[in-house]
């Protein structure tokens, strides 16, 4: 397992949300990929290929998300100061072997500023 | 050709309840969430209820938690909806609805193909 | 809950005409934001997906546009088809709601 610092942009603010951008190498064909606040998984997506290289995209919960080649990205809205913690990216490669988990993570600061859209 | 097809509605008393199943065709069901959506006679649309793939998150729209139940049975590409305690203000054409995965969204509620609807009348 | 207000109820047009319906949000809604066709006695027809994503199959006389909680669906050249009522709906926090619907009536 590493454990580390996104070495990226993770968090973009946008009318009163953030998405938390989770990257993987773009060689990753099957996966699971958790989002973590603190200890709590909040969200998670799951590609795997079937039979005939059918894809499978599959969610444990209602949490908006977004697949690339080579991230996912997870919405999170109607942010308050609750939200201020740390956001870990939780990686399990299954394809191509060996399995591995990757951890990656920052911290979500929340200012005033960011939660200026959901006064409207 | 996906394939959404209600059945179960009827008249019902006030009180009493009613079980409205959907069957799906066409794709692969148990990759995504459902949900029921209702009409009003002569009204806007309302969502109802949602429930991912495998039944680990389920939500409802205040006004019938307590009283509906979601559920799904893979096996059978069916989605069903209990409705006890039914009132007046129930009567609806129910949809059933497939949560749509265009452009690489997982998880937001919009909804691509729906069925037909099957009329449920709450009268005494 | 979000409210969805969308003007004008009806609208009268003729074929060939540019209507434009608008959405609000009473709330900031980012772009999560898919419209709907109903036409009499039918099921509801996918349009539009995050504010301004046109739906596969669906023709590009149709567009979206709009992010925050002012949204709005253009129907660049009216079509006898195009004839129906039209909903807005927020997926942003739940629970997800519906506009009241804008119906498009031949004039």
């Known amino acids: 397992e590493i454990n580390g610092s996104a070495n990226y942009e993770m968090f973009i603010f946008h009318n009163g949300g953030v998405q938390i951008l989770c990257k993987y190498p773009d060689i990753v064909q099957q996966f699971k990929m958790q989002l973590l606040k603190g200890g709590q998984i909040l969200c998670d997506l799951t590609k795997t290929k079937g039979s005939g290289n059918t894809v499978s995209i599959k969610s444990l919960k209602f949490c908006h998300s977004q697949l690339s080649n080579n991230s996912v990205s997870f919405f999170l809205y109607n942010l308050d100061h609750s939200h201020a913690n740390y956001y870990f990216c939780n990686l399990s490669i299954f394809d191509p072997p060996p399995f591995k988990v990757t951890l990656t993570g920052g911290y979500l600061h929340i200012y005033e500023s960011q939660l200026c859209c959901q006064l409207k | 050709e996906v394939l959404l097809v209600e059945s179960g509605g009827g008249l019902v008393q006030p009180g009493r309840s009613l079980r409205l199943s959907c069957e799906a065709s066409?794709?692969?069901?148990?990759?995504?969430?459902m949900h029921w959506v209702r009409q009003a006679p002569g009204k806007g649309l309302e969502w109802v209820s949602g429930?991912?793939?495998?039944?680990?998150?389920?939500d409802y729209t205040d006004s019938v938690k307590g009283r509906f139940t979601i559920s799904r049975d893979n096996a059978k590409n069916s989605l069903y909806l209990q409705m006890n305690s039914l009132r007046a203000e129930d009567t609806a054409l129910y949809y059933c609805?497939?949560?749509?995965?265009?452009?690489?969204?997982?998880?937001?509620?919009?909804?691509?193909?729906w069925g037909q609807g099957t009329l449920v009348t709450v009268s005494s | 809950d979000i409210q969805m207000t969308q003007s004008p109820s009806s609208v009268s047009a003729s074929v060939g005409d540019r209507v434009t319906i608008t959405c609000r949000a009473s709330?900031?809604?980012?772009?999560?934001l898919a419209w709907y066709q109903q036409k009499p006695g039918k099921a509801p027809k996918f349009l539009i997906y995050?504010?301004?994503s046109l739906q596969s199959g669906v023709p590009s006389r149709f567009s979206g546009s709009g992010s925050g909680t002012d949204f709005t669906l253009t129907i660049s050249s009216l079509q006898p088809e195009d004839f129906a009522t039209y909903y807005c709906q927020q997926a942003n926090s739940f629970p997800w709601t519906f506009g009241q619907g804008t119906k498009v009536e031949i004039k």
């Open positions: 429930i991912t793939w495998n039944s680990g998150s389920i």
């Open positions: 709330q900031g809604i980012s772009s999560w």
């Open positions: 066409g794709f692969t069901f148990d990759d995504y969430a």
């Open positions: 609805a497939k949560e749509s995965t265009s452009g690489s969204y997982y998880n937001v509620p919009w909804f691509d193909y």
């Open positions: 995050a504010a301004s």
